[in-house]
Interface confidence: medium
């Protein structure tokens, strides 16, 4: 047993152009308010599945009104901590949503209008009993900063919360009469002692003599900032300067979905998952009613009689998408093996293979590399009749012979330090910047200046963007 | 897959009460709005009530209003509807629906095409 708590530090428009000013409508003010969801699992779950770790809600943040002409403030928001608690064991692996609401104040027929602003999906890692993990994120055209972590309750001990501790002062039997107690472990309140060197802040064990590490970090001793980290698993105002990594660009960075549409990558490309109420490329179209004709590829609408009430299309086979857009992609299950190209025919999947390789699914290997060898404990890869060499870090060339310096470029920007390791380059930025390459500057009140345990918001403070 | 089972239902004499509860197998917690929908015979489906976001907020159908009163127990999974004063208009068959969500951007709690999970029914029959 424990509680996932998730503390919600700024939610805002996001950098850039085109950042709404309001997250009210025309019709009066409005207020904000935050729903968390937990599912199990790192893998894609329908959007319909249930919270099956627990849901949470905040309480309704004070009154917004937006005032014409004035710069857009940071958005009031909900006081406190939001709580999910879990009865059985942590599982590790889960999916995080947070959802942010908006009540609309003005009058409505029929009671307030409920509608949401943005939604925010994220697959994690954590440990339970580790510390605050912090993520900043984009839906649409807002952003959301917050903070999470998930601790143990009452006996319950360990990165899962399944080990029980008894009280040092608590009888070793049970009374008379009763079932045998559920096994408990004397003194558990004395941590494991780690693997020699294991990181204090970033590492931890539940056996002795191990180390792992929490999400950001790798290495033997989890000292090393992992290629992938988003910042999680740091704590304290040094982590500008920790090397800490953000994603390179990709497709879905700078918003291209609006009004809370999702974004997911796709090759050279991007798609937007539109919420209920909106298509388009980007989401851009909006107010929309069955009387529109919404629903694409000969989907059946059924909607409200009134103008407001939303609508859902029915997708003939072969489509999906809210709004039937999509046509379902049997080639995203990605069956052409060894890099082939896939054809959906409609009527059947054919694979392209490259040079080298044949078959149905491109699985018979026409073998480049018999007899192949690449130095310095490069790899050979198949393809196109002739091999190709995977070098190992710090070397290069057609057989890996040649040593390549990773940094010699000087990809550091912002005066940030270069340092090659097995895993790639690690950027350590100087103090005021942030991202792969330090490319980001941090905002003035900065990530950095998180505490350790975020506090509670109190009623009345000023609530600043990090 | 998420299931809910409907009981309580019954016959009774006008102005009396019955309480239905909605079994749920998954938590309710989880739900967007977890509602009350009733159908006679010959007419449409209707909403009755609805609750969502775990509590925060109720609806419920004027033709209710006053008389009914939607509730849910977290710790049980269960959502209940008190029904007092019944008339003998309010026989019907009454289902319990989850909404767990479909990307949606709105709620619209009495609408019965808004709700992805639905019970079997329970019938409730009120004799004058």
């Known amino acids: 047993a424990g509680v996932f708590e998730l503390q919600i530090h700024s939610f805002g428009p996001g950098p850039g152009p085109g950042a709404p000013r309001s997250p009210c409508s025309a019709r009066g003010p409005c207020r904000l308010f935050f729903r968390v969801c937990l599912k199990p699992g790192l893998s894609e779950e329908a959007a319909e599945s249930p919270c099956a770790l627990g849901a949470a809600l905040s309480a309704r943040g004070p009154v917004y009104t937006e005032q014409p002409e004035a710069p857009a403030p940071d958005l009031p928001l909900p006081n406190g901590l939001l709580q999910v608690p879990f009865r059985d064991a942590w599982p590790g692996t889960f999916s995080l949503i947070i959802e942010t609401w908006r009540e609309e104040l003005g009058d409505q027929i029929g009671g307030p209008a409920w509608s949401l602003l943005a939604r925010v999906t994220r697959r994690r890692r954590l440990a339970a009993g580790g510390p605050w993990a912090r993520d900043i994120q984009r839906a649409g055209a807002w952003e959301l900063r917050f903070s999470y972590r998930a601790r143990c309750e009452l006996l319950a001990v360990g990165t899962a919360c399944t080990r029980l501790c008894r009280p040092r002062s608590a009888p070793s039997r049970c009374g008379p009469g009763l079932r045998p107690c559920a096994p408990l472990e004397d003194e558990c309140e004395a941590p494991p002692v780690c693997r020699a060197g294991c990181s204090l802040e970033h590492g931890f064990c539940e056996q002795p003599g191990e180390c792992r590490c929490l999400e950001g970090w790798t290495g033997p001793l989890c000292t090393v900032p992992a290629s992938t980290s988003s910042c999680l698993g740091l704590r304290g105002p040094s982590s500008a300067t920790t090397g800490c990594l953000v994603p390179g660009p990709g497709p879905c960075d700078g918003n291209p979905c609006a009004n809370g549409g999702s974004c997911s990558e796709t090759p050279g490309s991007f798609e937007c998952t539109c919420p209920r109420g909106f298509y388009g490329l980007r989401c851009e179209v909006s107010g929309v009613t069955c009387a529109d004709g919404p629903c694409f590829n000969g989907g059946l609408c059924v909607g409200g009689a009134d103008p407001d009430s939303a609508y859902i299309c029915h997708c003939p086979p072969g489509f999906q998408g809210s709004n039937c857009e999509k046509r379902v992609d049997r080639c995203s299950l990605q069956p052409c093996r060894n890099g082939g190209l896939c054809l959906d025919l409609g009527h059947a999947l054919r694979c392209r293979c490259r040079a080298g390789f044949a078959g149905p699914r491109c699985e018979h290997n026409l073998d480049d590399c018999a007899g192949r060898a690449c130095a310095n404990g490069g790899t050979c890869v198949e393809g196109g009749g002739a091999h190709r060499c995977s070098c190992a870090l710090g070397f290069g060339g057609r057989d890996c012979r040649e040593r390549a310096d990773p940094c010699a470029a000087r990809p550091c920007a912002h005066g940030g330090r270069c340092y090659a390791h097995f895993s790639g380059l690690v950027c350590a930025c100087a103090p005021g910047y942030m991202g792969s390459r330090c490319e980001f500057p941090v905002h003035p009140d900065g990530v950095s200046a998180l505490p350790a345990a975020p506090p509670g918001l109190r009623p009345g403070d000023p609530q600043r963007y990090l | 897959e998420v299931q809910l089972v409907e009981s309580g239902g019954g016959s009774v004499q006008a102005g009396g009460s019955l309480r239905l509860s909605c079994a749920a197998s998954?938590?309710?917690?989880?739900?967007?709005?977890m509602g009350w929908f009733r159908q006679a015979p010959g007419k449409e489906r209707e909403g009755v009530a609805a609750m969502c976001f775990g509590g925060l907020v109720t609806h419920y159908a004027d033709s209710v209003k006053g008389r009914f009163t939607i509730s849910q127990d977290n710790a049980k999974n269960t959502v209940y509807l008190q029904m007092n004063s019944l008339k003998p208009e309010d026989t019907a068959m009454y289902y319990c629906a989850a909404d767990f969500g479909r990307d949606k951007n709105y709620l619209r709690p009495l609408l019965p095409h808004a709700y992805n999970y639905w019970g079997q029914g329970t019938q409730v029959t009120v004799s004058s």
């Open positions: 998954v938590y309710t917690s989880s739900s967007y709005c």
